[in-house]
C-alpha cells in the first residue's frame, strides 16, 4: 500500500487509568498531513467520537481508561501529499503494584518511570503526563512507598517534585497522582516511578550556561503584561533544576495568593551536544513594587537576573 513502516519501542501501561499516545514523527507531521489510528491492523479506524472509551483526538489516541483487553499493536497512518508512514506502537497493559513492598522496582517499566536522584545535590523527579489539550489536569500529589510526601526538603513545581539535599533514604518507589477531567468525567492518573540514587556527577560537573538574561534591565511601562524567557544551554545528561526566584523564593510561592507573577512550563530543544531549555516568567500586570527587584533565573549553580525599570521620560512629547 506504499506506506513506510516505523516501529516504536514497546510501552508498558497501567490498567484502569487514562493513557494517551501522540502520533508525531517529525518532520513528517510538521506539514499538512492526515493522521488515522487503527488497532491490530484493522481496516476500521479508531472512533473519533469523544464519548467513546477509546477514541482519536486530533493526532492522539486516547484511552479513558485503559483496560486489560487493550493490549496490542496500534498503528497510526500519517498521510501527506506525497508520502505515507505507518507507525506501529506495541501497548502492553499490566496491573499496577505501586504499593506492593515485595516488588523491588518494576524492571519492565519504560524509561520515564525510572528516574535517578543525585546524592547531596538538589534534584528533581518528573511526573510524565502526556495528554491532548482536551484533558484538563489537576494539581499533582506525590507519594513515596504509598505515603504522601511532606517535609521542607520537597517542593512541587509544575510537573516536578524538587528534592533538596538528596540522601540515600530518598531511593525507592514513588508515585505521582493527578485527576484528569475529560468531557466532564474525572479519572485518576497514578504513575509509579522507581527512583535510584547515584553519587556520580552525571554530567561531568559542567556548569549550565544562561544565554539570557544577562543581569540586565528591561524598560517596561507600569500596568503592562510582560513575558521574559530564560534561555539555558546544558549537557544532555544534566540533572539541574531550572526556575525563577525572587527574594530567594520560587516566584510561584512568592506570588502564591495573587498569582500575578508566574513561572511558565519548561520546554527544551535537543541538539547533538547539548539541550537548550526555556522557562519563562509572566508578569500579568507590572506594579510599582516590581521595579528594581532582581528576578533571578536559576539553572543548577548558575544564576542571572532581570531588573524592571520605568522607561525614561520622553521629553519630545512636551
Amino acid at each position: 500500500d506504499g506506506c513506510n513502516d516505523i516501529f516504536m519501542k514497546n510501552e508498558m501501561l497501567s490498567a484502569s487509568q487514562p493513557f494517551a499516545f501522540n502520533c508525531t514523527f517529525p518532520p513528517i507531521t510538521s506539514g499538512e498531513v492526515s493522521v488515522t489510528w487503527y488497532k491490530n491492523s484493522s481496516k476500521i479506524p479508531v472512533s473519533k467520537i469523544i464519548q467513546s472509551r477509546i477514541h482519536q483526538d486530533e493526532t492522539w489516541i486516547l484511552f479513558l481508561p485503559m483496560e486489560w483487553g487493550d493490549s496490542g499493536v496500534y498503528q497510526c497512518v500519517i498521510k501527506g501529499r506525497d508520502s505515507c508512514h505507518r507507525i506501529h506502537v506495541n501497548l502492553t497493559v499490566f496491573e499496577k503494584q505501586w504499593c506492593d513492598t515485595s516488588v523491588k522496582g518494576l524492571p519492565n517499566l519504560s524509561d520515564e518511570y525510572k528516574q535517578i536522584l543525585h546524592l547531596g545535590k538538589d534534584d528533581s523527579l518528573t511526573c510524565h503526563l502526556h495528554f491532548p489539550k482536551s484533558c484538563i489536569l489537576g494539581p499533582i500529589k506525590w507519594y513515596k512507598d504509598c505515603n504522601e510526601i511532606t517535609g521542607e526538603r520537597f517542593t512541587v513545581l509544575e510537573t516536578r517534585l524538587l528534592v533538596s539535599n538528596v540522601s540515600a533514604e530518598d531511593r525507592g518507589n514513588y508515585a505521582c497522582q493527578v485527576i484528569l477531567t475529560h468531557s466532564g468525567k474525572q479519572y485518576e492518573v497514578l504513575n509509579g516511578i522507581t527512583v535510584s540514587i547515584t553519587e556520580r556527577a552525571g554530567y561531568g560537573g559542567s556548569v549550565p550556561k544562561i544565554i539570557y538574561p544577562k543581569n540586565n534591565s528591561i524598560e517596561v511601562q507600569l500596568g503592562t503584561t510582560l513575558i521574559v524567557d530564560c534561555n539555558i544551554t546544558d549537557t544532555k545528561d544534566n540533572t539541574n533544576l531550572r526556575c525563577w526566584r525572587v527574594n530567594n523564593t520560587l516566584v510561584d510561592d512568592y506570588y502564591n495568593e495573587s498569582k500575578r507573577i508566574r513561572e511558565g512550563v519548561e520546554t527544551h530543544a535537543s541538539f547533538r551536544e547539548y539541550n537548550l531549555y526555556t522557562v519563562n516568567i509572566t508578569f500579568l500586570e507590572v506594579k510599582m513594587e516590581d521595579y528594581g527587584l532582581p528576578f533571578m533565573c536559576h539553572a543548577g549553580v548558575s544564576a542571572a537576573y532581570i531588573m524592571l525599570q520605568l522607561p525614561a521620560p520622553d521629553f519630545r512629547a512636551y
Epitope: K104, G105, P107, D111, K114, I116, L119, G120, A168, R171, G172, T194, V195, S196, I197, T198, E199, R200, A201, G202, Y203, G204, G205, T235, K236, D237
Partner: antibody, heavy 120, light 106 residues
Framework: QVQLQESGPGLVKPSQTLSLTCTVS??????GYWNWIRNHPGKGLEYI?????????YYNPSLKSRVTISRDTSKNQFSLKLSSVTAADTAVYYC??????????????WGQGTLVTVSS | DIQMTQSPSSLSASVGDRVTITCRAS?????MYWYQQKPGKAPKLWIY???NLASGVPSRFSGSGSGTSYTLTISSLQPEDFATYYC?????????FGQGTKLEIK
Amino acid sequence: QVQLQESGPGLVKPSQTLSLTCTVSGASITSGYWNWIRNHPGKGLEYIGYISYSGYTYYNPSLKSRVTISRDTSKNQFSLKLSSVTAADTAVYYCATGGYDYVEDALYYWGQGTLVTVSS
Amino acid sequence: DIQMTQSPSSLSASVGDRVTITCRASSNVRYMYWYQQKPGKAPKLWIYLTSNLASGVPSRFSGSGSGTSYTLTISSLQPEDFATYYCQQYTTSPYTFGQGTKLEIK
C-alpha cells in the same frame, strides 16, 4: 535477571586498538549506568569509564585520551575501544552495572570478564 | 584524585578469627563500596552505601566508617571468606578503587 557478556579478541598487537562489546539481557541500557573496569594481572581493579542512560560518557582521566565508550541501543550493547595499546593494557576487562537496591553505584551485575593480552 | 589506601595489603588469618580491613581515602568520601573477588572470577558487590550488605552476604560481615576512614569487619572468619577485598568511592571522579587486601589462610 540482568546478564552481561563481554566479547572481543583476546590478543591485540601493540599500538593497535582494543575493541570489546558488552551484550546486555534482562535490562535496557537506556536506564542506569554501564561501566567498564579492568583488572591487571596480579594487580588491583581500575575504573575505565561508563556510558549513562542518556548516552553521556565518562572516562577515567588517566585513560581519557585513548578510550571511547559507545552504545547500540537497538542491540542493547555497549562497547569499549582503547587505542594505542601497550603491554601495560594487558588485563581482564569487565563490563558491569549497578541499580541494586536502587543504588546505581552498587555494581551488582558483572560480566564474566575477558582477558586481553597485548603482545606482538 | 582521591587516593584509596587499603591496609593491610595482605593478611594471613585463621578460621574463627575476627578480621578488620581498613580503607583510607585522601579526602572525605560520602559512602564506601566493598567488593569481594576470588581468583579467576568477577568481583562481587559485598557492601554498599558503607554499611549495607549485598544479597547473599553473611551477617558476620559488617561495614562502617565516615569521612576518610572506612572498615570492613568479619566477626568470625570462615573458609569461604578467603579472597581479595576492594574498596571503592564514587564521591569524586575518577572513581577509584583501593589496591586490594588479600585475605589468606594462615
